[in-house]
């Protein structure tokens, strides 16, 4: 059977939400006039072929926008990008599409998202507001890698 993506809202521990600005995801403080994106999340159907104990492998998309988060190298450095992609197309592929996959780990109310293609690199936001989402290897330093997920609908 085919699953359906789960809509979620994501914010970091400093109550900043994800906003789409010029095709880039940025983290900004939650305010009245801010309209955060709704994230679509779906587990990889080939979970048995991926590493155990790293978290639940998921695809992350922007609800209703045909955009998905992916990791690609820019020079030597993995970077976080948005690509035009239908999340269900990724879900249905015959193999895990690793560049679009993240290991979702939960500890209490906190979630982390580790790149499957680049192990050890996590989705992060700078401690300063209004900054783009990035990938980082530096956990708990200048960047925040812990997020809170709220299931919608």
């Amino acid at each position: 059977k085919s699953e359906m993506p789960q809509p979620v809202s994501i914010q970091d521990i400093n109550h900043r939400v994800w906003v789409l600005q010029d095709q880039i995801l940025i983290a900004v403080p939650r305010k009245d006039r801010v309209s955060p994106v709704t994230i679509s999340l779906i587990s990889c159907r080939h979970v048995e072929t991926l590493e155990k104990d790293r978290g639940n492998p998921i695809y992350l998309g922007l609800n209703g926008l045909n955009l998905c988060l992916m990791c690609a190298k820019a020079g030597d450095q993995p970077t976080l990008q948005l690509k035009e992609k239908d999340i269900m197309d990724l879900y249905n592929q015959p193999e895990p599409v690793k560049s679009f996959l993240f290991y979702h780990s939960q500890s209490g109310r906190n979630s982390t998202f580790e790149s499957v293609a680049f192990p050890g690199w996590f989705i992060a936001v700078s401690s300063e507001g209004g900054c783009p989402l990035i990938l980082t290897q530096e956990l708990g330093k200048a960047n925040t890698t812990d997020f809170g997920l709220t299931m919608l609908f």
């Epitope: 048995e48 072929t49 015959p94 193999e95």
Partner: antibody, heavy 121, light 109 residues
Framework: EVQLQQSGAELVKPGASVRLSCTAS????????IHWVKQRPEQGLEWIGR????????RYDPKFQGKATITTDTSSDTVHLQFSSLTSEDTAVYYC??????????????WGQGTTLTVSS | QAVVTQESALTTSPGEAVTLTCRSS?????????ANWVQEKPDHLFAGLIG???DRAPGVPARFSGSLIGDKAALTITGAQTEDEAIYFC?????????FGGGTKLTVL
């Protein structure tokens, strides 16, 4: 240039085991899936299985489960296919192939040159 | 397990269009089978042509196209050339494994 270089021909006795090799160059083997395919004269291709070289997880066609074992050595960018309890039915040409995601889909885009395995007493 | 069937042989002339098909014993071929087409030339030279039913692999000439025709996957060569003489294999995905067809030997005379 992307290449899959396979090991040379093998002549082995029934009941024995054999290990075939496929060495990748021109790309990062961890970014793809490597498959093994069997071809017998005047017959089609048979899918044996595949490995994810980045983490070593495998899938097999049920027909080859327990008969074939696919492993990887990422330090040398090499994937191996091991066959046990060989019979004349295993006489064939074996190919490794890269399954690579590009654009929106996976492609069996690059293939090795094939390794001829002959099982005979 | 599904059996994948192809025409054993087809003949075409240079400049003509030819369509090769790929049938599954388990029912209609759909986009969920992610049909791949692979070309084999003499001396075991294989090259991928099509993935995901209708996506051309990088560098593959535009005369090669993949589609679904009725309940089958299809490879069409529009304006066949003599160098297209080869054996063409399809591969279909079934939930957790691939199945290849028996191949179609295409002669271009």
């Amino acid at each position: 240039e992307v290449q899959l270089q396979q090991s040379g021909a093998e002549l082995v006795k029934p009941g024995a085991s054999v290990r075939l090799s496929c060495t990748a160059s021109g790309f990062n083997i961890k970014d793809t899936y490597i498959h093994w395919v069997k071809q017998r004269p005047e017959q089609g291709l048979e899918w044996i299985g595949r490995i994810d070289p980045a983490i070593g997880t495998t899938r097999y066609d049920p027909k080859f489960q327990g008969k074939a074992t696919i492993t990887t050595d990422t330090s040398s960018d090499t994937v191996h296919l091991q066959f046990s309890s060989l019979t004349s039915e295993d006489t064939a040409v074996y190919y490794c192939a890269r399954l690579h995601y590009f654009g929106n889909n996976f492609f069996f885009d690059y293939w090795g040159q094939g390794t001829t395995l002959t099982v005979s007493s | 397990q599904a059996v994948v069937t192809q025409e054993s042989a087809l003949t075409t002339s240079p400049g003509e269009a030819v369509t090769l098909t790929c049938r599954s014993s388990s029912g209609a071929v759909t986009t969920s089978n992610y049909a791949n087409w692979v070309q084999e030339k003499p001396d075991h030279l294989f090259a991928g042509l099509i993935g995901g039913t209708n996506d051309r692999a990088p560098g593959v000439p535009a005369r090669f196209s993949g589609s679904l025709i009725g309940d089958k996957a299809a490879l069409t060569i529009t304006g066949a050339q003599t160098e297209d003489e080869a054996i063409y294999f399809c591969a279909l995905w079934f939930s957790n494994h691939w199945v290849f067809g028996g191949g179609t030997k295409l002669t271009v005379l």
